[in-house]
Structure formats: C-alpha cells, structure tokens
C-alpha cells in the first residue's frame, strides 16, 4: 500500500531573467527512493538517480542546475518557462509518486517573494 | 579511449554459477557505471544490472535472485555471478560502460561480447 | 517494466533511399530513449540518446525524433555499411528496457 505524501513548493512566481528552485519532499514512507525524475510536459529535464548522480538532459543543460538535495535550479527565466512541473519519485517497493508545482515567470519586477524556497 | 574485454568459461551445466569478469582500460571504474547486458541468440538485448562508481549494485527484478555484481578496484575490473542456469540463460554476455551525467541510461562503451552456453 | 515495441521488424531500403524505423513506449517515457546500431558480429554502437541527440562521430544521415510513448529513427539517405540491426531503449526508469530490434537491409 501507498502510504506517502509529497509536499512541493506549489504556485510559485519568478522574474524573467531570473532563478528559482522547484522542490519536492516525500514523507509518510519508508520506501526506498531509487529515481527522482524532473518534468515538463512531455520533456524530461532531469534524472536523479540514488546510484549514479545526476543527469541533465541536453535540451536543458545550459540553463538547469540540479539541487539542491533532490531539488532542481531553474536559470535564466523566460516567460516561456511559465507552466507546470513535476518530480516523479520512483520509489521501492511503493511505486510511482508524483508531486505538482505552478510556475509563473512574470515580466515585471511584481514577483511575489513569499515563495519558500526560492532564489532573491 | 575506454576499452572493456570480457573473459570467463564459454560452457557452463546447468544448475551451476556462470562467471564472468570484465577488465577495463583507459578509465577508473571508480568513475562511471559498469554493467552487464545479455544477448541470447537471434534476440534481443536485456540489461541484467550494474555496480556504480561508488560500489552500489542494482539488478534487473528478473534476475535480481540469482546475480551478483562486483568489482576489484585493484585491478580496474568487475564481475557477473549468475547462480541456478538453465538453457534460457545461454547468450553473448556484453560488459558496458554508461556515463549517467552526459547520457542517461544510454550505454556509450561495449566489450566485444563473450558467449555463454549452458549444456550438460 | 516498461516494455519497448519496435516495427518493423525487418526492413528493406534501397541504396540512398530513406529507412524509418519505429518504436513505442509501454508508457509515457518522455525523452528518455536511445537508440543502437549492432551489424552482425560486433556489438552494439550508440547512435542517439534522449530521443534526438546524435553520439559522437554519428554521421548526421541519422536522426531521432519523438517523446512521450513513440520514437522514430531514421537514416535519411541508406548507405550499404548501415546494414545493421536497430535497437531502441528506454532509460526513463529501471529496469532499463530495449526493444526487440529492426534489421536493416539493402533491396
């Protein structure tokens, strides 16, 4: 049985030109986290694997950073960037848990700062 | 340039452990992921597991009872115990090399391939 | 496991002509699929990993296209050392899969 939860950062805003760090937590199990896989749309923008590290796909190499911890760094912001995100946690022996964060990358200076997690 | 060259008995009974090592030149297996990828004849590929850069083992579910990976950091090598063969695990048995950073799970590094029979 | 489905199976293309080779994902993999070339006798070669990049030293006459559960390769003008057997595989979770391989040959 599925048990666990995620928590992630939610709806959150950024400037354009700017940063911001998308974070996902999976709490209420002990299952073992092998994978963590970082997506938008139909792209895949990153893999954390428990064994090999991290790898950044290659469309988004110049302007994703990983972390931190099982987090991921959004650089450079355009407002083509505004959409939805998700981390997939492959997880043993629970399966698949998927968390759901908004983001807003705004044109102005009006970016609302309350955001935990996010990058001044 | 990564060169891997797998060594091992060609004939193995059933119901006995297939053994097989790989020697790695050209690159420190303390780098990277190293795995074992089967082949059995006219068929397609299945990729049995790897030992990681840090030691760390995963294993395909299919066969994760009867396999072992490891390694000898000494002599730049790692090894495949498959315990309890039967004919289904005749094939040409591949050593690969896979760099997760840049390619993700695509495997950019091969041996030649030394093939396996099992027969009484 | 996320099994990986190629078509077709076997394939014949003149000299020069275009040769596509397909392939789908069990589920939604994202981009997360490379693709081999093995001629017979030798092991297989990466060509194209997440979904559209070309390997080192891969002659841009190969292409990858697609994401989410459908791939493509294709070799836009068939040479005769391309004759080969074409394998497709998903990294986008382990166990990591392959697809059942397309042979490629001259008509």
């Known amino acids: 049985m599925m048990t666990g939860t995620i928590e992630t950062t939610g709806n959150i805003s950024a400037e354009k030109g700017g940063s911001i760090i998308l974070q996902c937590h999976l709490s209420s199990t002990t299952a073992q986290v092998t994978q963590v896989n970082w997506e938008q749309q139909d792209q895949l923008l990153a893999i954390c694997n428990a064994d090999l590290g991290w790898h950044i796909s290659p469309s988004f190499k110049d302007r994703v950073a990983p972390g931190p911890g099982l987090g991921l760094t959004l650089q450079s912001l355009t407002v083509n960037d505004t959409g939805e995100y998700f981390c997939i946690y492959h997880t043993y022996p629970d399966g698949t848990y998927t968390g759901r964060i908004f983001l807003e990358v705004l044109e102005s200076s009006v970016a609302e700062h309350g955001a935990r997690f996010q990058i001044p | 340039e990564v060169q891997l060259q797998e060594s091992g008995p060609g004939l193995v009974k059933p119901s006995e452990t297939l053994s097989l090592t790989c020697a790695v030149s050209g690159y420190s297996i303390t780098s990277d992921s190293w795995n074992w990828i089967r082949q059995p004849p006219g068929k397609g590929l299945e990729w049995i597991g790897y030992i990681s850069y840090s030691g760390n083992t995963y294993y395909n579910p299919s066969l994760k009872s009867r396999v072992t990976i490891s390694r000898d950091t000494s002599k730049n090598q790692f090894s495949l115990k498959l315990s309890s063969v039967t004919a289904a695990d005749t094939a040409v048995y591949y050593c690969?090399?896979?760099?997760?950073?840049?390619?993700?799970?695509?495997?950019?590094?091969w041996g030649q391939g030394t093939t396996v029979t099992v027969s009484s | 496991d996320i099994v990986m489905t190629q078509s077709p199976d076997s394939l014949a293309v003149s000299l020069g002509e275009r040769a596509t080779i397909n392939c789908k994902a069990s589920q939604n993999v994202r981009t997360a699929v490379a693709w081999y070339q093995q001629k017979p006798g030798q092991s297989p070669k990466l060509m194209i990993y997440s979904a559209s990049y070309r390997y080192t030293g891969v002659p841009d006459r190969f292409s990858g296209s697609g994401s989410g559960t459908d791939f493509t390769l294709t070799i836009s003008s068939l040479q005769a050392e391309d004759v080969a057997v074409y394998y497709c595989?998903?990294?986008?979770?382990?166990?990591?899969?392959f697809g059942g391989g397309t042979k490629v040959e001259i008509k």
């Open positions: 595989q998903q990294y986008y979770t382990t166990p990591w899969t």
């Open positions: 690969a090399r896979l760099d997760f950073s840049n390619y993700g799970g695509a495997v950019d590094y």
